[in-house]
Amino acid sequence: KAMHVAQPAVVLASSRGIASFVCEYASPGKATEVRVTVLRQADSQVTEVCAATYMMGNELTFLDDSICTGTSSGNQVNLTIQGLRAMDTGLYICKVELMYPPPYYLGIGNGTQIYVIDPEPCPDSDF
């Protein structure tokens, strides 16, 4: 049976280039090992933004050089993507894989459209 993954349709990044959204999955079984991947889709090309594998009940840990951070609570993952610029505007898809125990399940969200607006540079002050 398919695993449903829910995520918000639209998120606006902060002026500091930070966007946060929740990725929630309806687990068909009692998974103990879960992998969460954030994918970016642009012009039908899909690329990986970041990924983390975590054990249920433990914290979600991305690699040190990752632009993502996150926390997990049950079947819900709170994801934060940092360092975004206007050119990074696009559709960010949450992919969830229940790796263990069997059976394996794959869940693909519909994607969150993240809008990033570069802040206007501060005008030079005469004072």
Partner: antibody
Framework: QVQLVESGGGVVQPGRSLRLSCAAS????????MHWVRQAPGKGLEWVTF????????YYCDSVKGRFTISRDNSKNTLYLQMNSLRAEDTAIYYC???????????WGQGTLVTVSS | EIVLTQSPGTLSLSPGERATLSCRAS???????LAWYQQKPGQAPRLLIY???SRATGIPDRFSGSGSGTDFTLTISRLEPEDFAVYYC?????????FGQGTKVEIK
Amino acid sequence: QVQLVESGGGVVQPGRSLRLSCAASGFTFSSYTMHWVRQAPGKGLEWVTFISYDGNNKYYCDSVKGRFTISRDNSKNTLYLQMNSLRAEDTAIYYCARTGWLGPFDYWGQGTLVTVSS
Amino acid sequence: EIVLTQSPGTLSLSPGERATLSCRASQSVGSSYLAWYQQKPGQAPRLLIYGAFSRATGIPDRFSGSGSGTDFTLTISRLEPEDFAVYYCQQYGSSPWTFGQGTKVEIK
């Protein structure tokens, strides 16, 4: 460009062993899960086994469970299939396949033929 | 295990005609997890459609996929000589990964 090249096939007697390899290039191997799929002569496609990114999680079809072992060496960009206690019904072309970001098998090797016969 | 049943087993058509291939699942498959592959003699399978209706890179727009739940369709709007091959559907939403038995599209 993405390339998957299988090797190690051949003719083997029932009960014997064989080890297949799949050399991957053109992509970050450790970022993808991988599969072996086989096709008996004149028949359809049959999924055989799956391995996770780090090699910690493995799944097998019922007909090979306990006889076949999938493994990977991310430092060598290579996928393996150790086949033990081979049977005549294991005769097939064996393909390695990459799982695309959204789940389908987006790239396949050219296949290697395994013939189990006395 | 999700069993996929393809029909018809063989489709005899002429170039320029429309081909409609069916894939029925034994239980509901999310449309995000259904793919179609093309295989020509002596070649490896090639991904055509994923997510039930998204074309893979480089696949011409005469190939289209549709369906949801348990019933899926691959349509080739106008057959070209190079389209005569065997087509397989596959579900990849849960293990074991399963394929249909294939539909052969042959020249009439």
